[in-house]
Interface confidence: low
């Protein structure tokens, strides 16, 4: 029977800069029941607090609701593991909510095949930002990434959409059923999970153009851009 091993706070994430959750890995239990507590203070302030909510984030977690989340402040936190033989502390973790945002996936992904009379057909995608993100505050610049692949293919084709919430792709395989997903990230932060896949059947008469892909932003009030295959690969994010 020994004191508990050193725990480790391994991840903190916020969906929207208004709340956040941190998770820790327990160390060895020393063969005895072990209690864990997370304590924190805000850098530049002095009073240390205990985790306000050990439940919401699941086992070995601490959730900070709106009332306990301060923007632009660094939180200094550590986990204390205690059993009958003694205690051990994790290393201190410094957390700035601004840099741990991982949004929910974008919503309402709509995918359509457009076949205008005067232009080549294209695949048109549209989506909405996650509901928890208030873009009006100016706190967020959300960037989007789209991926798509034929249903039976192993490899995804990925496109960086910038801040657009619409995207158009010309070069697709006729007659194939495609899966399409979108994800987002704030300018400082983590990519969301991919949205649920949307399926779209590409018609057999879809005209494919290998040399260039036309991405039209006219619906967004922008200009048409002729983007080469090389340029698209430059925007490819892994």
């Amino acid at each position: 029977q020994l004191p508990p091993g050193k725990p480790e706070i391994f991840k903190c994430r916020s969906p929207n800069k208004e709340t956040f959750t941190c998770w820790w890995r327990p160390g060895t239990d020393g063969g005895l029941p072990t209690n864990y507590s997370l304590t924190y203070h805000r850098e530049g302030e002095t009073l240390m607090h205990e985790c306000p909510d050990y439940i919401t984030g699941g086992p070995n977690s601490c959730h900070f609701g709106k009332q306990y989340t301060s923007m632009w402040r660094t939180y200094v936190m550590m986990v204390n593991a205690t059993n009958q033989m003694g205690s051990s502390f994790s290393d201190e973790l410094y957390v700035d909510v601004t840099y741990i945002v991982q949004p929910d996936p974008p919503l309402e992904l709509t995918v359509e095949v457009k076949q205008p009379e005067d232009r080549k057909p294209y695949l048109w995608m549209k989506w909405s930002p996650p509901t928890l993100i208030d873009l009006k505050t100016g706190w967020f610049t959300l960037l989007y990434e789209i991926r798509l692949k034929p249903e039976k293919a192993a490899e995804w084709e990925t496109h960086f959409a910038g801040q657009q919430t619409e995207f158009k792709i010309l070069s697709l395989h006729p007659g194939q059923k495609y899966l399409v997903q979108v994800r987002c990230k704030p300018d400082h932060g983590y990519w969301s999970a991919w949205s649920p896949a949307t399926f779209i059947q590409i018609p057999s008469d879809f005209i494919m153009n290998d040399e260039q892909k036309l991405i039209s932003e006219e619906d967004l009030g922008g200009e048409q851009k002729l983007i080469s295959e090389e340029d698209l690969h430059h925007h490819h994010h892994h």
């Epitope: 507590s37 304590t39 203070h41 302030e45 002095t46 009073l47 240390m48 607090h49 205990e50 306000p52 009332q67 306990y68 301060s70 502390f89």
Partner: antibody
Framework: EVQLVESGGGLAQPGGSLRLSCVAS????????MSWVRQAPGKGLDWVGN????????NYVDSVRGRFTISRDNAKNSLFLQMNSLRAEDTGVYYC?????????WGQGTLVTVSS | DIQMTQSPSSLSASVGDSVTITCRAS??????LDWFQQKPGKAPKSLIY???ILQGGVPSRFSGSGYGTDFTLTISSLQPEDFATYYC?????????FGPGTKVDIK
Amino acid sequence: EVQLVESGGGLAQPGGSLRLSCVASGFTFSTYWMSWVRQAPGKGLDWVGNIKQDGSEQNYVDSVRGRFTISRDNAKNSLFLQMNSLRAEDTGVYYCATLLTKGDYWGQGTLVTVSS
Amino acid sequence: DIQMTQSPSSLSASVGDSVTITCRASQDISNYLDWFQQKPGKAPKSLIYAASILQGGVPSRFSGSGYGTDFTLTISSLQPEDFATYYCRQYKTYPFTFGPGTKVDIK
């Protein structure tokens, strides 16, 4: 059990000096900020100042800045308040307090009387 | 400095009464507020921190609420041991400042 025991209070002349001590037990002293708070007879509580875990930062209320110095000795679990240029209005009970996770813990206080 | 005011400065109540004490900050302090109880000749005792989190071992009849500048401490059913003076304190910015206190005595 957290315990804080203050000592060093007593009678001092205006302009004189006193050094208060606070010995801590029952928690990891070096992990926490420490504060001094005082209470004039029959009056409310006044925050005097505090000191960071490693002693590298102190903060003071304006009325004592330049006259009082807070220090600590983590090896001895001890907190100190050096009071110079004492004034009548410094009279009161002086408490040391830990700013611990679940709120503050306080000692029982030591009385400082500044009078000629 | 942030000024803290409390009202009322004193109140008389009976055992079983519900009592509410108000604390107001001169500027926004978010939820950086503590409540303390002090009995004559004794050190203050921490009741609530971060405006609404009950200190370990404090009876659930005590509750705190508020955010920004206006805060309340409520004792839902006053017990004989609750007759004391109650202080709020802000720790948003230095210097930390206490309210002047509210004395709760027996009617």
